[in-house]
């Protein structure tokens, strides 16, 4: 449905508060280095303009597209060339090329300082002094660091952030109330950002067919009682929402997400029995709740799939008539029966089935050719089952820190060209799969673990794309979305890698080590471990363990010393020499 003024349409649909929040997020995700005040000024100007269009949709410029309006506004920033370099060239382009240009310049790893959390009293004062500015600052700081954060969901995080301060700044012990809430929001926010980044990568690198296949599998697991047509409708709508958000069309995305939530709540009976409690909530909470809703119970009367997909003589006819619909139904039927499978496994199974049909439907006797197709499925199912079992056993044996170290060594040996900070970040996050998934009942382990690993490996792919250094990483990242994790799992020690020359500076530590938090200490030690493996990629587990144990003992000793710096200066070179000897 067309509107005379798109900006007026969205302002009226979303309301002023959400409109302003979303425009701020959009601008902060595009111009990630701009100061807060500059963004607030731009947002206020856009909002005032939108109000004039609401008053009179025929007013000057009100008929322009949102990309034109927002792009024009971004291109008024005076320091664009100095701050962003070649991104300023985007402003010479016309829409839609200009927006595509801005999208291509989004930086997944912006050079921004880590957010430092002020004292609780300082934060509470700032919150009470100017609540609106305080919340805008939150949106701005998160959005610029996470340029693909799911914008309507970020508004939900901001609402929770506001609620935490409103409650805790009144509490007797403000810190005890507030800090756990902020930690939870930070961790959930990072996870939400990474999950959305995979959705955007799926759409942008592999197209909407890949995203739709993912959505069919996931929604069929969630809503196993829903008909295929219902699941298909939800998939189409969800694809539109995420395509818009990933494309920077945040107002349209938020509006369409609200429409989808409304539709789901009006059609609960044909979707899922689990939606009731979500549908009583206010909009932002409702949409979040629907996205996270637990799987409905599987119908008790589902027949074997063999009849329709193997035994039927019409398999090739049905496939040829509408390939994607037939494969979509296969995926739907498989997924609704298997909430115990990861989405990525289900997609591999559908891919294997598709490959078999492509081959067999061109054969002399198609039925004979595909009669045992499901025998090809068993190893695909057992591979992630075994992987989860082995890694959960290792996690239970080692604990999180040492499990992360095992993964650091494993991945550094696979792809030693990757930068040390990236290997540390990715391996630490891969290691978190243990605490997240291994405690779950068996039925939930594989979907938790493999789909989480897909999100973490996407972060590796996104960072590597910015600065490509390894052909192996490029190959695993670009060849097949669903086979990324098996591709990385299959990588062995890189025999072609020339070990990094030893640099004593890398292994020189100072007294500041002693004042670091436990997490920061771990990162320091893990950074050293990666450098060690890059220097000696063929070092054995025992050798590396010995060096790391000596390292821990050396740091502990010097941190207990009266003159810490002198201890580090004296003991450091001894540690380096002993380590070199141990690894010789």
């Amino acid at each position: 449905d067309t509107h005379k003024s798109e900006v007026a349409h969205r302002f009226k649909d979303l309301g002023e508060e959400h409109f302003k929040g979303l425009v701020l997020v959009a601008f902060s995700q595009y111009l990630q280095q701009c100061p807060f005040e500059e963004h607030v000024k731009l947002v206020n100007e856009v909002t005032e303009f939108a109000k004039t269009c609401v008053a009179d949709e025929s007013a000057e410029n009100c008929d322009k597209s949102l990309h034109t309006l927002f792009g024009d506004k971004l291109c008024t920033v005076a320091t664009l060339r100095e701050t962003y370099g070649e991104m300023a060239d985007c402003c010479a382009k016309q829409e839609p090329e200009r927006n595509e240009c801005f999208l291509q310049h989004k930086d997944d790893n912006p050079n921004l300082p880590p957010l430092v959390r002020p004292e609780v009293d300082v934060m509470c004062t700032a919150f009470h002094d100017n609540e609106a500015t305080f919340l805008k600052k939150y949106l701005y700081e998160v959005a610029r660091r996470h340029p693909y954060f799911y914008a309507p969901e970020l508004l939900f995080f901001a609402a929770r952030y506001k609620a935490a301060f409103a409650e805790c700044c009144q509490a007797a012990d403000k810190a005890a109330c507030l800090l756990p809430k902020l930690d939870e929001l930070r961790d959930e926010g990072k996870a939400s950002s990474a999950k959305q980044r995979l959705k955007c990568a799926s759409l942008q690198k592999f197209g909407d067919r890949a995203f739709k296949a993912w959505a069919v599998a996931r929604l069929s697991q969630k809503f196993p009682k829903a008909e295929f047509a219902e699941v298909s409708k939800l998939v189409t709508d969800l694809t539109k929402v995420h395509t818009e958000c990933c494309h920077g069309d945040l107002l349209e995305c938020a509006d369409d997400r609200a429409d989808l939530a409304k539709y789901m709540c009006e059609n609960q009976d044909s979707i899922s029995s689990k939606l009731k409690e979500c549908c009583d909530k206010p909009l932002l909470e409702k949409s979040h709740c629907l996205a996270e809703v637990e799987n409905d119970e599987m119908p008790a009367d589902l027949p074997s799939l063999a009849a329709d997909y193997v035994e039927s003589k019409d398999v090739c006819k049905n496939y040829a008539e509408a390939k994607d619909v037939f494969l979509g139904m296969f995926l739907y039927e498989y997924a609704r029966r298997h909430p115990d499978y990861s989405v990525m496994l289900l997609l591999r199974l559908a891919k294997a089935y598709e490959a078999t049909l492509e081959k067999c439907c061109a054969a002399a006797d198609p039925h004979e050719c595909y009669a045992k197709v499901f025998d090809e499925f068993q190893p695909l199912v057992e591979e992630p089952q075994n992987l989860v079992k082995q890694n959960c056993e290792l996690f239970e044996q080692l604990g999180e820190y040492k499990f992360q170290n095992a993964l650091l060594v494993r991945y550094t040996k696979k792809v030693p060209q990757v930068s040390t900070p990236t290997l540390v970040e990715v391996s630490r996050n891969l290691g978190k799969v243990g605490a997240k998934c291994c405690k779950l009942p068996e039925a939930k382990r594989m979907p938790c673990a493999e789909d989480y690993l897909s999100v973490v490996l996407n972060r590796l792919c996104v960072l590597h794309e910015k600065t490509p250094v390894s052909e192996k990483v490029t190959k695993c990242c670009t060849e097949s979305l669903v086979n990324r994790r098996p591709c990385f799992s299959a990588l062995e020690l890189d025999e072609a890698y020339v070990p990094k020359a030893f640099n004593a500076e890398t292994f020189t530590f100072h007294a500041d080590m002693c004042t670091l938090s436990e997490k920061e200490k771990q990162v320091k030690k893990q950074t050293a471990l990666v450098e060690l493996v890059k220097h000696k990629p063929k070092a054995t587990k025992e050798q590396l363990k010995g060096v790391m144990d000596n390292f821990a003992a050396f740091v502990e000793k010097c941190c207990k010393a009266d003159d810490k710096e002198a201890c580090f200066a004296e003991e450091g070179p001894k540690f380096v020499a002993a380590s070199q000897a141990a690894l010789a």
Partner: nanobody, 116 residues
Framework: EVQLVESGGGLVQEGGSLRLACAAS????????LGWYRQGPGNERELVAT???????SYADSVKGRFTISRDYDKNTLYLQMNSLRPEDTGLYYC??????????WGQGTQVTVSS
């Protein structure tokens, strides 16, 4: 061909407990639902309890709160813990495995007799 073997049946006093087990002779890779059924004297076979691979459980109204269905992945075994048994629980208890790509599998049954 995979076999299902039930065990744990027997004679028990009213109010007593039994634990039935159903073991598969080999690992079954395409299970999607497991269930216990029973056939009382002169009755049709009826559903007692099911558990999906997503760990959702469902029970016949007559056994709710008294029976618990569970499975052990590593041992490839399905269980039915039966407490507060009643004479009307008497019958032949069968386990069933529903598969995604093959015909469903049934065990040969184990007899449960509850005396008053």
């Amino acid at each position: 061909e995979v076999q299902l073997v039930e065990s744990g049946g027997g004679l028990v006093q009213e109010g007593g407990s039994l634990r039935l087990a159903c073991a598969a002779s080999e690992r079954i890779w395409d299970i999607n639902l497991l269930g216990w059924y029973r056939q009382g004297p002169g009755n049709e076979r009826e559903l007692v309890a099911t558990i999906t691979v997503g760990d959702s459980t469902s029970y016949a109204d007559s056994v709710k709160g008294r029976f618990t269905i569970s499975r052990d992945y590593d041992k490839n075994t399905l269980y039915l813990q039966m407490n507060s048994l009643r004479p009307e629980d008497t019958g032949l208890y069968y386990c069933k495995i529903r598969r995604t790509w093959h015909s469903e599998l049934w065990g040969q049954g184990t007899q449960v007799t509850v005396s008053s």
